[in-house]
């Protein structure tokens, strides 16, 4: 209840997260008449990326474009990108939708289609659907430890969500263990009323809200966090312009002294940790 006699001040907070878990991934890549099944293990360094602010990212799905090299090649024949003669291709033109700079030539992409030749990382990325089910769907069982230090400078009071008495092998549960700061990703989604398996395909943004309602008076002292969860991105992926959450990154390597790269379009969940609350003292 609101204690009008108290002097209130907003919480100042810092957050640190640590994700743990291993995923076994079976990739199924078909090209040139060969379906290549690849089995790989993903650990924390493979699926998490450092983010600024109170956020962390877990990759749940990806599309790879392997063996790209900087050269000339036909651009991907997306809608409106096909040509029939060089007149359609403008030397030096950089179409925002394209992956390179046009050379001015119209060249065969395959047996039936021609597109403008571009100077780019080749072969250019194909517009592929995100794999379904998600390749790292087992990320549902990953856990994240959230360390949250808070401070009320006006009241000269500092505390943290992790208490010395806490068990390092606990898992957060709204009823049985509401003060445990280790969260199973699947449980976060369940609490928010979302389906992890579904969101994992295209990615999304999930909010972890930490609410501190602190009574700092010595006679009725209470200052513990309350956790709640809600999805922050537009879940109606059919209606939203760019569904889900994804970004691209590349792994560079040399083969026969030629610089090459594997382009990875990573889909996943960005978790935003939102800390708010007040501290009140007489």
């Amino acid at each position: 209840s609101d204690k009008l006699y108290q002097r209130k001040e907003p919480v100042i907070s810092s957050v640190h997260t640590k994700v743990k878990g291993i995923a076994e991934v079976t990739e199924n890549v078909t090209e040139g008449g060969v379906t290549k099944l690849g089995h790989s293990i993903f650990d924390t360094a493979d699926y998490t990326f450092p983010l600024q602010g109170n956020s962390f990212f877990v990759m749940t799905n990806y599309v790879k474009s392997e063996g790209q090299v900087q050269t000339l090649c036909p651009e991907y024949p997306r809608r409106g990108a096909q040509c029939s003669s060089d007149r359609r291709c403008k030397k030096g033109w950089m179409d925002p939708q394209s992956k390179g700079i046009q050379t001015g030539r119209c060249v065969p992409y395959d047996k039936t289609r021609k597109t403008c030749e571009v100077s780019a990382w080749c072969p250019t990325e194909e517009e592929k659907e995100a794999p379904r089910p998600a390749l790292l769907r087992s990320a549902e069982n990953f856990t994240v430890l959230i360390k949250n230090n808070i401070h009320f400078p006006g009241h000269n009071y500092t505390t943290r969500n992790i208490l010395p008495t806490m068990n390092g092998s606990c898992t957060f549960h709204k009823t049985w263990d509401p003060q445990c700061s280790i969260f199973r990703l699947g449980d976060i989604f369940q609490e928010a009323g979302e389906n992890f398996t579904e969101v994992a395909v295209q990615g999304g943004i999930m909010g972890i809200e930490i609410y501190w309602d602190c009574n700092l008076d010595s006679w009725s002292h209470h200052c513990r966090p309350r956790y709640s969860f809600r999805r922050l991105d537009d879940k109606n992926t059919d209606e939203s312009f760019v569904p889900g959450y994804n970004f691209r990154y590349a792994k560079y390597y040399k083969e026969n002294n030629v610089e090459k790269r594997t382009l990875i379009k990573a889909f996943g969940i960005r978790f935003d940790i939102l800390v708010f609350g007040t501290g009140g003292k007489f």
Epitope: E31, G32, G33, V34, T35, K36, L37, G38, H39, K111
Partner: nanobody, 128 residues
Framework: EVQLVESGGGLVQTGGSLRLSCAAS????????IAWFRQAPGKEREGVSI???????FYADSVKDRFSITADGAKTTVFLQMNSLKPEDTAIYYC??????????????????????WGQGTQVTVSS
């Protein structure tokens, strides 16, 4: 009509080399991947090597670093260069056009995409 004709088999001593050829007609190598399979007496057929229609190569673990698959410039003939041959390489070698699965060093036919087109085979015997 799709046709595959193998040649180049024969008798060779352990450590020796052979070069098998597969002449393809009725289609181009842009349409299908080409693989070499082999069958030893009393054993199951096993995939040895694949040349995908975009030029990527795949090898079974048992022949990696010893065998090499290539095609000629006109993409009408596929070769299997076999070096450091061992008695366990003795088998009938078949050239196959179709769709294949490569799974951690094992090669098989992608039967979901049909049974492929097979040549009549060429015998390779490695004596010790």
């Amino acid at each position: 009509e799709v046709q595959l004709v193998e040649s180049g088999g024969g008798l060779v001593q352990t450590g020796g080399s052979l070069r098998l050829s597969c002449a393809a007609s009725g289609f181009t190598l842009d349409d299908y991947a080409i693989a070499w399979f082999r069958q030893a007496p009393g054993k199951e057929r096993e995939g040895v090597s694949i040349l995908s229609s975009i030029g990527k190569t795949f090898y079974a673990d048992s022949v990696k670093d010893r065998f090499s698959i290539t095609a000629d410039g006109a993409k009408t003939t596929v070769f299997l260069q076999m070096n450091s041959l061992k008695p366990e390489d003795t088998a009938i070698y078949y050239c196959v056009a179709g769709h294949f699965v490569y799974n951690d060093g094992a090669i098989s036919l992608n039967t979901a995409r049909g049974s492929g087109f097979w040549g009549q085979g060429t015998q390779v015997t490695v004596s010790s």
